[in-house]
Interface confidence: medium
């Protein structure tokens, strides 16, 4: 037997990080992101509750709301109306997936400085919204969604298809929720009100996932989702737009779906409101390489949408999928007619394309071996875009503007230089026409919260600065995070390392990859982070890497689509190749280098554990994907293909972890799964610990009783945290 | 081919009631895109639409003229689309034009040959 050892940080009066810090969550940072109700006007909910109301302009500020409000109801969460005359307050939060969860919402009269009393809303709310001007609600309730033309007034009922997991009217059935929209709701006003948009949902033919939940019963619940896996029968979805002014009159209109889409199986992909009667649609194919934007109009004279073949823009994409992980949204100019978006130039970046007619004759905004990657604002004369362009750290995020009145347009960054060494990650939030914005950096130093003047980009004030955390760092000995890049052959790889305190090259180290490695993801970010892993090599003395292999982000087509129907080649390839690289540095004890990932990360660390290369000697998997049969249609075939004989089954069949079980009989392996896991179903893992035993291959696993993909409450997590801290220190010969 | 094919008109008492059929053949009218139209020409007076379906959503839309005394309907299996016209007066004297369009062109771009309606003691 080794003898154990045990890393000792020197000398140092500061002491190392804890499990218990990262637990109890005691190094958590705070943003601020101003609630804008105006062009200088924004709300904050305070350290107390109370909901404040900032004027930059004349530097007033007053609670609109108080905390004793929001208590009397027990409100987690508020809304104003645009009118200013109402607030609605949730409460009773009850998460069901990602982004959607139920609530109970009270109408709360600012004039009056009460309750609205009657016509009180229906519980639980499954969506509920403020028109664009004025205070009217919108409110999904069991499926169907509906209307009052102000607070007090009685409800009028827009849909009455709505049926549980049958037909889901304004919110997304699971899968469009995760793999599509992102979002809890399915509906969207016009800018002024009179129109109200919504997608319609028919999960009839859906195979349904059945899992059990435990509970403290004598019998098990079981969970019923209609859960397209990859193959099977998708959502039926269709898009309707009513009037609410007269709803009663004309009824819901659905905008028809482009011709060169409807021929086959397709999805919607967004709705944006260009004005008060255009609205912009997207759609694309199921196999998703082809993506159409469609512009329609509304026609009075018909009372009906018209898409015109002239206002329809095709995307799509030759080497692999059409968009980045989602397909991008366009942000349209005064106009109403032209717009910006950010696809793919014909070296294979995404960059901003400025589309007046035709998407043929897009004119290049930004160009260059980086990625644009988020329009924030078009104004009169300004785009505020996101990039990784400064520097050539793909990690790093910077706010740039771009003068559209000028010719040609001149170019900005506004956050390169603010803070160059706290601050190289940032995101901004902008008053309606940009008159002021937030800027939020989120590393690699302490996160900052900034507010900024729209014209001159000059900063007014600190919004928040994380003092309080800076001041409880003071005596922690935290690692030293470098990031990097590796050179193998003709590809280059971004990677992240967090070593030890007192780190010295001359030593040998263990070392723990963590890896996720999804299609269009990215881990090598210049973020600030005090997680499991810096407790890891603060306390534990561990070689942390993280490292960016092909099939993730921001570096160009050729580096995404590498992945395209072959997934499980490549991303295990690369962290492969980048720990011989990490060995070859010298100070990587050889015999102890272990792997974990979650979701993709727990596939990619399987497989990479299964590589037969012998240069891990233990590993984890939470969550892990097995098979890609067994994922959502829309993940799984935005990057397989379909699993048919005359498409991609063969690989689909030889991706599997399931395949690789032999592999698994020299290393030490702990599967990790929570029961209730309504994404990556609990059936991956039964499958990779059904195969496992029947090849008589040892290994440890875990499983949560009732817990989803996060494993999140806050017993689970302590129990898994402490059960992988002690399965690699036992891994690694390290003494508790 | 796309066509379009009227019946059921005739002539009629005032206070009495029609019921005009248009057959559709190579077009699906319950498809999205697809909106059916009864428009009416007489002699002297405007084109008129007096009424307009999109069989999928069964959305519909009347000329203030017609309200409430004329419903249009359509019926997907049968690929067909009714104007049931009660209440007639002197003034619905016209020739009925079935009409389709495919909103993804502007106008209504197919027509049948017209049904004429007579209300007339």
């Known amino acids: 037997l080794r003898p154990s050892r045990v890393y000792k940080p020197e000398g140092n009066t500061k002491r190392a990080l804890t499990l218990k810090d990262i637990l109890n969550g005691t190094f958590s940072y705070k943003t601020y992101f101003p609630n804008w109700i105006s062009e200088q006007e924004y709300l904050h909910q305070s350290e107390d509750d109370n909901i404040v109301f900032y004027n930059i302009e004349t530097r007033e500020s007053y609670i609109i709301l108080s905390n004793s409000t929001m208590k009397s109801v027990n409100a987690t969460d508020y809304g104003l109306s645009p009118d200013r005359q109402f607030v609605y307050l949730e409460s009773d939060y009850s998460k069901l997936w990602r982004y959607s969860y139920t609530a109970t919402y009270y109408i709360y009269d600012l004039q009056n400085g009460e309750f609205v009393r009657g016509y009180e809303l229906p519980r639980p709310i499954q969506y509920l919204c403020w028109s664009p001007v004025g205070s009217k609600l919108a409110y999904v309730y069991q499926n169907n969604i509906y209307l009052k033309q102000r607070p007090g007034d009685p409800p009028f009922q827009i849909t009455y298809t709505g049926r549980e997991n049958r037909i889901f009217n304004g919110i997304p059935d699971w899968v469009y929720e995760e793999e599509m929209l992102a979002t809890k709701y399915a509906l969207w006003w016009s800018p002024d009100g009179k129109f109200l948009a919504y997608v319609e949902f028919n999960d009839s033919d859906i195979p349904i996932i059945a899992y059990s939940y435990y509970g403290d019963g004598q019998y098990p619940r079981t969970i019923n989702i209609p859960y397209p896996k990859a193959g099977a029968k998708n959502p039926v979805v269709r898009v309707f737009i009513v009037d609410t002014t007269y709803p009663h009159h004309v009824g819901p209109m659905e905008v028809p779906v482009p011709e060169m889409i409807a021929s086959s199986d397709y999805y919607f992909s967004w709705l944006t409101w260009v004005s008060s009667e255009r609205v912009c649609l997207q759609w694309l194919k199921r196999v998703q390489n082809v993506s159409v934007l469609s512009i329609c109009d509304f026609r009075e004279d018909w009372h009906a949408w018209e898409c015109p073949k002239n206002q329809e823009h095709v995307e799509e994409s030759r080497t692999g999928w059409a968009g980045g992980f989602f397909v991008s949204t366009p942000a349209f100019s005064q106009d109403a007619t032209s717009y910006y978006k950010i696809f793919s130039d014909k070296d294979g970046y995404k960059h901003i394309h400025y589309i007046k007619d035709t998407v043929e004759n897009a004119i290049q905004i930004t160009s260059g071996k980086w990625e644009a990657i988020y329009i924030f604002r078009v104004t009169q004369d300004s785009l505020f875009y996101s990039s990784n362009e400064f520097e050539g750290y793909p990690g790093r995020r910077n706010i740039y503007r771009i003068s559209i009145g000028n010719s040609p347009p001149s170019k900005k960054c506004v956050t390169c230089h603010l803070r160059k060494e706290r601050c190289q990650y940032y995101t901004a939030s902008f008053s309606y026409k940009a008159k002021y914005y937030a800027l939020v950096c989120y590393g690699p130093g302490l996160p900052i919260s900034t507010l900024h003047d729209g014209r001159t980009d000059q900063e007014i004030q600190v919004l928040e600065e994380n003092k309080e955390l800076e001041n409880s760092l003071r005596n922690i000995q935290l690692p030293k995070v470098e990031i990097k890049k590796l050179k193998d052959g003709g590809l280059t790889f971004w990677y992240k390392m967090i070593l030890p305190p007192q780190f010295d090259r001359s030593k040998k180290y263990p070392l723990l990859i963590q890896v996720y490695g999804g299609p269009c993801s990215q881990s090598v970010k210049s973020v600030f982070a005090v997680n499991w892993i810096t407790y890891l090599a603060s306390k534990e003395g561990i070689v942390i890497a993280l490292v960016d292999g092909r099939g993730t982000a921001f570096q160009g087509d050729k580096f995404l689509h590498a992945v395209y129907r072959k997934l499980g080649v490549y991303e295990v390839e690369d962290q492969l190749t980048a720990v011989r690289k990490f060995i070859e540095m010298g100070f990587i004890d050889e015999e102890r280098i272990a792997i974990w990932g979650w979701s993709y990360g727990g596939y990619v660390s399987s497989l990479a554990l299964a590589s037969g290369t012998g240069l891990f000697k233990c590993g984890i998997a939470v969550a892990p994907v097995s098979s890609w049969e067994y994922y959502a249609s829309i993940y799984s075939e935005r990057f397989m293909g379909l699993p048919t004989k005359d498409d991609n089954l063969e690989h689909y069949k030889n991706s599997t972890v399931m395949a690789r079980a032999e592999y698994f009989r020299n290393v030490d392996y702990l599967l990790i799964h929570g029961t209730a896991d309504d994404n990556v179903h609990f059936q991956n893992s039964a499958q990779i610990a059904k195969a496992l035993v029947n090849a008589q291959v040892d290994f440890q696993a875990m499983w949560y009783s009732d817990q989803n993909h996060g494993i999140s409450s806050g017993r689970s997590q302590n129990h898994l945290y402490t059960h992988m801290t002690h399965f690699l220190k036992q891994c690694f010969s390290l003494s508790d | 081919e796309v066509q379009l094919v009227e019946s059921g008109g005739g002539l009629v008492q005032p206070g009495g009631s029609l019921r005009l059929s248009c057959a559709a053949s190579?077009?699906?009218?319950?498809?999205?895109?697809?909106?059916i139209g009864w428009v009416r020409r007489a002699p002297g007076k405007e084109e008129e639409l007096v009424a307009r379906?999109?069989?999928?959503?069964?959305?519909?839309r009347y000329a203030d003229s017609v309200k409430g005394r004329f419903t249009i309907s359509c019926d997907t299996s049968k690929n067909t689309a009714y104007l049931q016209m009660n209440s007639l007066r002197a003034e619905d004297t016209a020739v009925y034009y079935c009409?389709?369009?495919?909103?993804?062109?502007?106008?209504?771009?197919?027509w049948g040959q017209g049904t004429t309606v007579t209300v007339s003691s």
């Open positions: 009409a389709g369009r495919q909103s993804y062109n502007y106008g209504y771009i197919y």
């Open positions: 190579g077009f699906n009218i319950k498809d999205s895109s697809t909106y």
């Open positions: 379906i999109q069989c999928s959503s069964g959305s519909t």
